[in-house]
């Protein structure tokens, strides 16, 4: 009786989002599963998701460690189930991932608008400073806590009754922008991080317009 | 080749500590998982936990959690189970395993056997 | 937990006669492993991943099944292959062994 045949995997693919990690490849196993490993440039491959069925493994305990590192995978691939086999010979076929440096590489969330306040012909709109899965001191960072200063934020707003938008700009969490007094305005942001080469910006957020729930508005 | 070879067999009292070793060779340690098992006499076998050498990372089974302390300590390559508040429960032959190809618990070493009497 | 229920708990066999044990679990798993253990030695990984047999084991034995139905057969008993032997799983956490069967030679 021979061994069975197994398929290396092909197409590793880093999914990541404000951190959270998924590495996703290709062929859906037949008669085979995949134990995946992950190792920076100087450690050791550490084993993760052992022989699963499943293309993806979720690789962000492993990289929330240091989002700074630069991180490499692999997918190890094994006969297995009902299949003709005879022992095991050598070492399984394996295929790497590219390298992952999540500091640099992990997309920004989708942001929202936490909330916005007028204050006669101030508008104050706050970001919602979103939960990451990085952990310091047994307590979850924020993303403004990872990122600092590298991360800016975008506001793209505009009178309801018109379709010319203005930007602001703010390191922080929070724009203080003026307004025309009477007027309901629209808002969306979108995260930057701008000192960087790809996944430079996220998508923008919902469009949040004074007048409804989230709003605040004071006649001053 | 990969060998686990672990400390000689303990007798112990009731209430007390005990913990047990195993030194690796013919491998990178801090590379691999590392299981303990424990087997009591004439019965079958018990996953207790693990421990992945290169970083400390470590999972146990909830019945043991409180009961078993896995370390590892690199510079020897030597991996640790302390068991505390001993009973004639825990008499038993305990193994180190380590995972390897095809399966988590390819390799063994040879138990040891942990007898608790007052 | 899965729990693993293996039968015969006892069983003997002549040399030469075909030899089938089987492991039920308590709930669907997705590949069972078998382990060899003789007295006062360790177990030793017999088969992998359902049907893969481990290195240096024998061509008489096989592994088969899927779901909640699992087992072992040995085409022609032989006195080295008397043991006890081991199912295990770990598609859930924690992995869990069977009672294990004892395999007697006649």
């Known amino acids: 009786s021979g061994t069975t045949n197994t398929v290396a995997a092909y197409n590793l693919t880093w999914k990541s989002t404000n951190f959270k990690t998924i590495l996703e490849w290709e062929p859906k196993p037949v008669n085979q599963v995949y134990t995946v490993q992950i190792s920076t440039k100087s450690g050791d491959w550490k084993s993760k998701c052992f022989y699963t069925t499943d293309t993806e493994c979720d690789l962000t305990d492993e990289i929330v460690k240091d989002v700074k590192q630069t991180y490499l995978a692999r997918v190890f691939s094994y006969p297995a189930g009902n299949v003709e086999s005879t022992g095991s010979a050598g070492e399984p076929l394996y295929e790497n991932s590219p390298e992952f440096t999540p500091y640099l590489e992990t997309n920004l969330g989708q942001p929202t608008i936490q909330s916005f306040e007028q204050v006669g012909t101030k508008v104050n709109v706050t970001v919602e400073d979103e939960r990451t899965l990085v952990r310091r001191n047994n307590t979850f960072l924020s993303l403004r806590d990872v990122f600092g200063k590298d991360l800016i934020y975008t506001l793209y707003y505009w009178k309801s009754s018109s379709s010319g938008k203005k930007t602001a700009k703010t390191n922080t969490n929070e724009f203080l922008i003026d307004v025309d007094k009477g007027e309901n305005y629209c808002f969306s942001v979108q995260a930057v991080i701008p000192s960087r080469t790809v996944n430079r910006k996220s998508t923008d957020s919902p469009v949040e317009c004074m007048g409804q729930e989230k709003g605040e508005f004071r006649e001053i | 080749q990969v060998q686990l070879q672990q400390s000689g067999a303990e007798l112990v009292r009731p209430g007390s500590s005990v913990k047990i070793s195993c030194k690796a060779s013919?491998?990178?340690?801090?590379?691999?998982?590392m299981y303990w098992v424990k087997q009591r006499p004439g019965q079958g076998l018990e996953w207790i936990g693990q421990i992945y050498p290169g970083d400390g990372d470590s999972n146990y089974n909830e019945n043991f959690k409180g009961k078993a302390t896995l370390t590892a300590d690199k510079s020897s390559s030597t991996a640790y189970m302390q068991l505390s508040s001993l009973t004639s429960e825990d008499s038993a032959v305990y193994f180190c395993?380590?995972?390897?190809?095809?399966?988590?618990?390819?390799?063994w070493g040879q138990g040891t056997l942990v007898t608790v009497s007052a | 937990q899965i729990v693993l229920t293996q039968s015969p708990a006892l069983m003997s066999a002549s040399p030469g006669e075909k030899v089938t044990m089987t492991c039920s679990a308590s709930s669907s798993v997705s590949y069972m492993y078998w382990y060899q253990q003789k007295p006062r030695s360790s177990p030793k990984p017999w088969i992998n991943?359902?049907?893969n047999l481990a290195s240096g084991v024998p061509a008489r034995f096989s592994g088969r099944g899927s779901g909640t139905s699992y087992s072992l057969t040995i085409s022609s008993m032989e006195a080295e292959d008397a043991a006890t032997y081991y199912c295990?799983?770990?598609?859930?956490?924690?992995?869990?062994f069977g009672g294990g069967t004892k395999l007697e030679i006649k």
């Open positions: 013919g491998y990178t340690f801090s590379s691999y998982w």
């Open positions: 395993t380590r995972e390897g190809y095809g399966n988590r618990f390819a390799y």
């Open positions: 295990q799983q770990w598609s859930y956490n924690p992995p869990t």
């Open positions: 991943l359902t049907s």
